[in-house]
Structure formats: structure tokens, C-alpha cells
């Protein structure tokens, strides 16, 4: 898909650049996993709306495709979810982040991962030392990824006899027990996969490919970018202002994103002795809904009001807190008289055009 030139916003100065950022993160997920992609805005400035694009087509949020601030989650992933994902600024199509995602059949088994590389013809007639079959895929020697992402190093090779592959970390033999969460060695894929990387995974990773005729090696450097812990993020526009007819049902929604376990509460602003705030400036509120023994986060993200009365009108707040801090969004409920009264008003003096 050709996007032509586009404006890249860098420190508020526009420059013309190509359609893809230089960093393309390669991620592997297992079938049934949740694909999670994160894309914080460069410079942290206001970017306007964003859109996630897969293989050139815009992704619409659904039950399975969840979108939050700078974040995409695809639940219960399957082969069809493999592809090129980018997070773009909606208005200009500026590519903020780019990911290459592969969803494999058997995430836990070492040698039965299928895909395009399975078809590589690694059979060699003449005896000889190992050689790289896809050197163009090994250009990216420095990989910088956010913590909790999946990293995959590959060294596709061939030789006769078929060479073996082993891995070193910082020059020493690297095995699964050397890291929490272990590693996945996929010999047929000539790959090393580490899920949920942490800062201690930083270092130099070397693949050693050898047979009796010789040995070749390639070193990759991994940098793990620590997530800056933050208070919960609440989805823009939620909860939304609502207008309801007397006696009807209303739902307020609040979408919370938080690395640390969030605690969600729904509050209603009330007046005490004619005042909305206390002597210290804190608003008077009543807690309508909070976490209980049997309440799920999903249930807490919705506040349902049944058979609303005029007393229900007012300001409602979704308050979310975690170990780092609190965030809150508010919305107003306007309660209108029942429909019959409105019809009379309409007939009395409404002019319709269009």
C-alpha cells in the first residue's frame, strides 16, 4: 500500500518522511493468546485520534479487538491475525509504531511451528560448512523493546550435514532455566523466543550454528525499555454525558487501562447543606458501586441506573486507582419529563428543516 509522503510530527516541526518508521518490532504469539501491542506517542504531545491498521486496512474495535489509549489487544488470536500492524495518527496517517505479528499453531512446542519459513528449502546436496539462508533478515542487530513484550531472535541457516544451533547470552551458554519464564528454542525455525521480557534480559545474544565443516555465529543486542509505572488510564469520552426520559434505564461506561491492578469506584456528586464541596474543597460524593468479593472488573466498568427519577440527574464520576495514583472521568445525566409532555411541546412550536 503506497501512502506517498506524509508529515511526521517531531517536536512540532513537520518533515517529509517515508511511510514506515525505521523500528519494526517482530512479535510471535501462540494460537489462542491475546496479542497485545503498545504504542506510546512520541514526545507525549497531543496526537489527536489514532487508528490501528492491519495489512493496510483500518481495525474497528469489537468484542475481540480492544483498543485503548495507544494500545491494541486482539483476544483469542488465530493465524488470520498474523500480519503487519501499525498504529497511526488518524488525521495524517503518520505511522507511530509498526509491528510484524505472527500467530503460530503451537506456542509451547519447540519444533512444529509452521509458517512461511517452514517451506525454506534447507536441503543441501554438497557437503559443506553452514551458511545463512536469510541474511537480509538478520540486519537488525540491535533490538529495543518495551518490557513485557515478546522477543524473537532468528538465525536461519543451512549446511550439509544439517548444522546444529545453540545460543549464548553475553558469551555464556544460555538455557531456559537462566530466566524466569524460560525460553523457547525452535530448532526448525532457527529461533530463540523469550516472552514477557524484563530488564534483566538485556544483553548480547549469540546464535552459534555449526557442523563438522565449520561454524558461523551472529550476535544480537537486546535492550529492554522499562515501562514507566503510571496511574490508571481512562478511555477518552467515557463515561459519556447521557440524557434519559423519566422512568427509563441508563448505563454509564468507564474503560480502565492499568498495568497495576486497578480499584474502580462509581461516585455520584451530592449537595450537603446546599454546598457541592466541603470546607477543604473536596466534592461531596456518595459511593454507588465499588469492588466487592464477587464483583469483576468488567462489571465495575458499567454503572446501571434503572427507572431513573429527577433525583438521579447530576454528575457521576468513575474513579480508578492503583498503587501509583488515581484517575477520574465524570459525566452528567440529564433526566427529561416523560414522552407525552414532550410531544405536546413539539406540536406547540417546532419547525423542522432537512
Amino acid at each position: 500500500e503506497s501512502l506517498g509522503t506524509e508529515q511526521r510530527v517531531v517536536g512540532r516541526v513537520a518533515e517529509v518522511s517515508g511511510p514506515e518508521p525505521s523500528q519494526q518490532e517482530q512479535l510471535v504469539f501462540g494460537s489462542g493468546d491475546a496479542v497485545e501491542l503498545s504504542c506510546p506517542p512520541p514526545g507525549g504531545g497531543p496526537m489527536g485520534p489514532t487508528v490501528w491498521v492491519k495489512d493496510g486496512a483500518g481495525l474497528v474495535p469489537s468484542e475481540r479487538v480492544l483498543v485503548g489509549p495507544q494500545r491494541l489487544q486482539v483476544l483469542n488470536a488465530s493465524h488470520e491475525d498474523s500480519g503487519a500492524y501499525s498504529c497511526r495518527q488518524r488525521l495524517t496517517q503518520l505511522v507511530l509504531c509498526h509491528f510484524s505479528v505472527r500467530v503460530t499453531d503451537a506456542p509451547s512446542s519447540g519444533d512444529d511451528e509452521d509458517g512461511e519459513d517452514e517451506a525454506e528449502d534447507t536441503g543441501v546436496d554438497t557437503a559443506g560448512a553452514p551458511y545463512w539462508t536469510r541474511p537480509e533478515r538478520m540486519d537488525k542487530k540491535l533490538l529495543a523493546v518495551p518490557a513485557a513484550n515478546t522477543v524473537r531472535f532468528r538465525c536461519p541457516a543451512a549446511g550439509n550435514p544439517t548444522p546444529s544451533i545453540s545460543w549464548l547470552k553475553n558469551g555464556k551458554e544460555f538455557r531456559g532455566e537462566h530466566r524466569i519464564g524460560g525460553i523457547k528454542l525452535r530448532h526448525q525455525q532457527w529461533s530463540l523466543v523469550m516472552e514477557s521480557v524484563v530488564p534483566s534480559d538485556r544483553g548480547n545474544y549469540t546464535c552459534v550454528v555449526e557442523n563438522k565443516f565449520g561454524s558461523i555465529r551472529q550476535t544480537y543486542t537486546l535492550d529492554v525499555l522499562e515501562r514507566s509505572p503510571h496511574r490508571p488510564i481512562l478511555q477518552a469520552g467515557l463515561p459519556a454525558n447521557q440524557t434519559a426520559v423519566l422512568g427509563s434505564d441508563v448505563e454509564f461506561h468507564c474503560k480502565v487501562y492499568s498495568d497495576a491492578q486497578p480499584h474502580i469506584q462509581w461516585l455520584k456528586h451530592v449537595e450537603v447543606n446546599g454546598s457541592k464541596v466541603g470546607p477543604d474543597g473536596t466534592p461531596y460524593v456518595t459511593v454507588l458501586k465499588t469492588a466487592g468479593a464477587n464483583t469483576t472488573d468488567k462489571e465495575l466498568e458499567v454503572l446501571s441506573l434503572h427507572n431513573v427519577t429527577f433525583e438521579d440527574a447530576g454528575e457521576y464520576t468513575c474513579l480508578a486507582g492503583n498503587s501509583i495514583g488515581f484517575s477520574h472521568h465524570s459525566a452528567w445525566l440529564v433526566v427529561l419529563p416523560a414522552e407525552e409532555e414532550l410531544v405536546e411541546a413539539d406540536e406547540a412550536g417546532s419547525v423542522y428543516a432537512g
Epitope: 500500500e1 508529515q7 510530527v9 512540532r12 516541526v13 513537520a14 504531545g45 497531543p46 496526537m47 489527536g48 485520534p49 489514532t50 487508528v51 490501528w52 491498521v53 493496510g56 486496512a57 483500518g58 481495525l59 474497528v60 474495535p61 483498543v67 485503548g68 489509549p69 497511526r88 488518524r90 488525521l91 495524517t92 496517517q93 478511555q235 477518552a236 469520552g237 467515557l238 459519556a240 474503560k255
Partner: antibody, heavy 121, light 110 residues
């Protein structure tokens, strides 16, 4: 053929409420960003609010923040604008506008014919 | 007072080339795309140009858009009587977190 048909306009007193609807057809409504744009009599265009499918975000012009609420019902292919605490300066023709595809640069490529909202006592 | 500044009027004779300017700032035109709309009397606006200079299908190539820094221009060559209309520029504004329109330019074909 893309069609956008606004309704719900009319005469309302200052402080009153109105709900505008925009019935969409001829395209996959849920996949497109939508906006409301208004035009006061004899004046220029003013963007009012936009609702973005790609990230669920909603934006409002400062002049209507806290009073107007944009929403959509994808099952009914309908865009709404709930207008509360209406003022005389909200008097305008309100247009519903469709944005271009999500994977292309933003622009209002289709517009409805508009519905007139008159706020007067 | 509009965030984007356009001349209130412009005029030309049939066959002439007319240019309409639109001036903004780094928070809108300088860091975002500009689109142009034509509004014939008594009708809804119609998209003429988007992404600074792209033309939707069906728009004659007599209409062209350009941009430099924080200013954009709409050029109409081979002016025709049916081009008599109001023309508006628009862009997203980062500091306002919303779209902004120019005040509009009334084009008269003499």
C-alpha cells in the same frame, strides 16, 4: 451510494434540549469516523464534534463542551447529537459528515443536507 | 474570529486562474493536512481537496491545492461561472484537539 440524512432539528427555547439524528446508508457505518459540523445563518462552517472508530475517542469544540454529546448506534447505522442547555448562538444548520477510510488521510468526503436548529424564545 | 484566516472575497473572469489563501499556525496547518470544501448557494459543502493536494475522484483537475509552512492555497484555473461559491479550508488543530475551519471565501465570477 452514500447517503446521510439528518433529522431532529426544530425550534427550541434557550436552555432547552434537542437530539439530532443522522441516518447513514451506502457504506459500512461502523468502520468510519463521523462528525457534526454546523453553519449559523449567513456565517461560515464550524466543526462541532467528532467520534472516531479507530480508538473510540470523542472530541468536541470548546463552544459546546459539557453541553453536547455525540454518540452512535452501529446496529442502527445512526449518528446522534444530544444538545442540552441550548443558547441562541447554537442556532444553525447542523450537518452530519462522514470521514474518509480509516487508513487514509482524514477529510469530510460526504455531507448530509443538514437540519435547522433554531434557539429562540 | 476563525482560527484559520481566509480572505472574505475573491473574484475573477471566466478562463482566469484564481488563488484563495488560508493562513494558520504550527498547531494546525504547520503540522497537519489541509482540506478544502466548496459550498454552492443553498447546498451542503462538497470536498474539493484533501491531504493538502489530493483530489477526490470526480473533482476536475482545474482545482489544485498546495501548502507551504503554515499557509495553504487553493487554485482554480480556467474559471467557470459554476465555480461561484463559498470556499472553506479546514485542518485539525492539536492545541484545540479539534477541527478548525477558515472563515470562508466568497468567489465571484465576473
Amino acid at each position: 451510494e452514500v447517503q446521510l440524512l439528518e433529522s431532529g432539528g426544530g425550534l427550541v427555547q434557550p436552555g432547552g434540549s434537542l437530539r439530532l439524528s443522522c441516518a447513514a446508508s451506502g457504506f459500512t457505518f461502523s468502520s468510519y469516523d463521523m462528525s457534526w459540523v454546523r453553519q449559523a445563518p449567513g456565517k461560515g462552517l464550524e466543526w462541532v464534534s467528532g467520534i472516531y472508530s479507530g480508538d473510540g475517542s470523542i472530541y468536541y469544540a470548546d463552544s459546546v463542551k459539557g453541553r453536547f454529546t455525540i454518540s452512535r448506534d452501529n446496529s442502527k447505522n445512526t449518528l446522534y447529537l444530544q444538545m442540552n442547555s441550548l443558547r441562541a448562538e447554537d442556532t444553525a444548520v447542523y450537518y452530519c459528515a462522514k470521514d474518509g477510510p480509516m487508513n487514509e488521510e482524514s477529510r469530510f468526503d460526504y455531507w448530509g443536507q443538514g437540519t435547522l436548529v433554531t434557539v429562540s424564545s | 474570529q476563525s482560527v484559520l484566516t481566509q480572505p472574505p472575497s475573491a473574484s475573477g473572469t471566466p478562463g482566469q486562474r484564481v488563488t484563495i489563501s488560508c493562513s494558520g499556525s504550527s498547531s494546525n496547518i504547520g503540522n497537519n493536512y489541509v482540506s478544502w470544501y466548496q459550498q454552492l448557494p443553498g447546498t451542503a459543502p462538497k470536498l474539493l481537496i484533501y491531504a493538502d493536494s489530493k483530489r477526490p475522484s470526480g473533482v476536475p483537475d482545474r482545482f489544485s491545492g498546495s501548502k507551504s509552512g503554515t499557509s495553504a492555497s487553493l487554485a482554480i484555473s480556467g474559471l467557470r461561472s459554476e465555480d461561484e461559491a463559498d470556499y472553506y479550508c479546514a485542518s485539525w488543530d492539536y492545541s484545540l484537539s479539534g477541527y478548525v475551519f477558515g472563515g470562508g471565501t466568497k468567489l465571484t465570477v465576473l
